[in-house]
């Protein structure tokens, strides 16, 4: 019971997770102007993966997509694809699930296939929420960096002609989305490798017998024996578990570099 | 088409309270950013207060800020603008103005304006 | 505050002939998010209330005469008119539509010689 519930929340939690990375991605709140210096600005400009707008006093909001590929910055390219690559994963995740979740039953599948099928997505859910949450602090990387230089040169000129004051942008909505649901994700994808531990079944435990000795009873139960087959097909489930649990120590050890953001 | 027509103005001593009121018509009222302008004596305009669509942002003139309340009913298609302590520099005429959708924040119709005298 | 100057304070031109008049922010009214400048001019007859003639520094507003132009970038700016004519005396604004608060110019009285 309660490997099915583990299996069903990871699910859920993940499913939330993966929808809150869809959003972010396409959320045009990715770097909002920052206001310090001029908090009554009558234009506010906020900028997306895919678009820039500017929303004005008068209420009218004028989007502009970035209609240019080769253009663009390498470091969005690698937050979108490193956001696109975490959908994907998630949505393949999400779909392998479905048939996994022990609720469900689809034919005659046994429970060592969706014990596989659960870990299979539980990995997809970390690498996704990986993904996303790389891309977001990659961003954010991004956006520090840049707010220090133009705050070290705030005004710069326009081809030579007139002083202009440069536009400083921090940290949008969509930043804090991602973290989120990477986070999201990335926790479901543990709980579905937790659940996958108690999904397969055990080898079939030898029934006790009982060996009448002149004297005295004594009842031998050959544990020692089943351990000596080395778990059966127990093995192929904790080895699988432990690969499982070697992502989770990547998560730890993901580079922090990102962390002072 | 367009129109705006202010109302509640006099003359009224140094410290005492006023609202003006401008009636809009021709136009989805709740959809516009609205202002008040003010034109001193001296001719001079000066930008007095905005409220956005929904009522929710209101920006104001420093000298104005805590004295002045700008304020919106979008059921009436009615603009506000409620004045307190009034002194002696705030006799102007006063109009009330639209700021356009795509008029890049300009104000692109005005009421014809009501005075304001503020002396005792 | 954004400080709007205007110039000349009065301007008196020959019918037919070109008037300009300058307007300088004392900051930068360019917006980077959309590379517009956000500036109006405005066109004020005795006894009316001012009437908007140009937005974003450089477009028309509807109905108004094509002898109005605007140009200018950053914080220099100029209202030309090509071909004065008698309706357009009246005194000219303009003003920061890009921070609060929107700051006007003193105005530029616009004669015929």
């Known amino acids: 019971m309660a490997v099915t519930a583990c299996q069903g929340l990871g699910f859920v939690v993940s499913l939330i997770g993966i929808a809150g990375i869809i959003a972010a991605t396409c959320m045009d709140q990715w770097s909002t102007q920052d206001l310090y210096n001029n908090p009554v600005t009558a234009v506010f400009n906020y900028q997306g993966l895919w678009r820039s707008c500017v929303r004005e006093s008068s209420g009218f909001t004028e989007c502009r997509g970035y209609f240019t590929l080769l253009g663009l910055p390498a470091m969005l390219q690698a937050v979108r694809a490193l956001m696109i690559v975490g959908i994907v994963l998630g949505a393949i995740g999400l779909l392998v699930s479905i048939f996994a979740l022990k609720c469900i039953r689809i034919g005659s599948m046994e429970d060592s296939a969706k014990a596989n099928m659960t870990l299979t997505s539980g990995i997809m859910f970390i690498v996704s929420g990986l993904c996303a949450i790389a891309g977001v602090s990659v961003f954010a990387n991004m956006l520090v960096t840049n707010f220090w230089m133009s705050t070290a040169n705030m005004y710069t000129g326009m081809g030579g002609m007139v002083q202009t004051v440069q536009t400083r942008y921090t940290f949008g909505a969509a930043l804090f989305v991602g973290w989120v649901a990477g986070g999201l994700t990335l926790i479901g994808g543990v709980m579905m490798c937790i659940a996958c531990r108690g999904l397969a079944p055990e080898e079939t435990n030898y029934k006790a017998v009982s060996y009448h000795a002149s004297g005295h009873s004594v009842a031998y139960k050959p544990g020692g024996f089943k351990a000596s087959t080395g778990f059966g097909s127990n093995t192929k489930n904790k080895k699988i578990y432990d690969g499982g649990a070697r992502t989770e120590d990547e998560v730890q050890s993901y580079p922090s570099k990102h962390d002072y953001v | 088409e367009v129109m705006l027509v202010e109302s509640g103005g006099g003359l009224v001593q140094p410290g005492g309270s006023l609202r003006l009121s401008c009636a809009a018509s021709?136009?989805?009222?709740?959809?516009?950013?609205m202002s008040w302008v003010r034109q001193t004596p001296e001719k001079r305009l000066e930008w007095v207060a905005t409220?956005?669509?929904?009522?929710?942002?209101?920006y104001y003139l420093d000298s104005v800020k805590g004295r002045f309340t700008i304020s919106r009913d979008n059921a009436k298609n009615t603009l506000y603008l409620q004045m307190n302590s009034l002194r002696a520099e705030d006799t102007a005429l006063y109009y009330c103005?639209?700021?356009?959708?795509?008029?890049?924040?300009?104000?692109?119709?005005w009421g014809q304006g009501t005075l304001i005298t503020v002396s005792s | 505050d954004i400080v709007m100057t205007q110039s000349p304070d009065s301007l008196a031109v020959s019918l037919g002939e070109r008037a300009t008049i300058n307007c300088k922010s004392s900051?930068?009214?360019?917006?980077?998010?959309?590379?517009?400048?956000?500036l109006a001019w405005y066109q004020q007859k005795p006894g009316q209330p001012p009437k908007l003639l140009i937005y974003?520094?450089?477009t028309r507003e509807s109905g108004v005469p094509d002898r109005f132009s605007g140009s200018g970038f950053g914080t220099d700016f100029t209202l030309t008119i090509s071909s004065l004519q008698a309706e357009d005396v009246a005194v000219y604004y303009c003003?920061?539509?890009?921070?609060?608060?929107?700051?006007f110019g003193a105005g530029t009285k616009l004669e015929i010689k």
């Open positions: 409220i956005v669509g929904g009522g929710g942002y209101t």
């Open positions: 103005a639209r700021m356009g959708l795509t008029q890049r924040n300009a104000l692109d119709y």
């Open positions: 900051q930068s009214l360019f917006n980077s998010g959309n590379q517009k400048n956000y």
């Open positions: 974003g520094a450089s």
């Open positions: 021709g136009f989805t009222f709740s959809t516009y950013t």
């Open positions: 003003q920061n539509d890009h921070t609060y608060p929107l700051t």
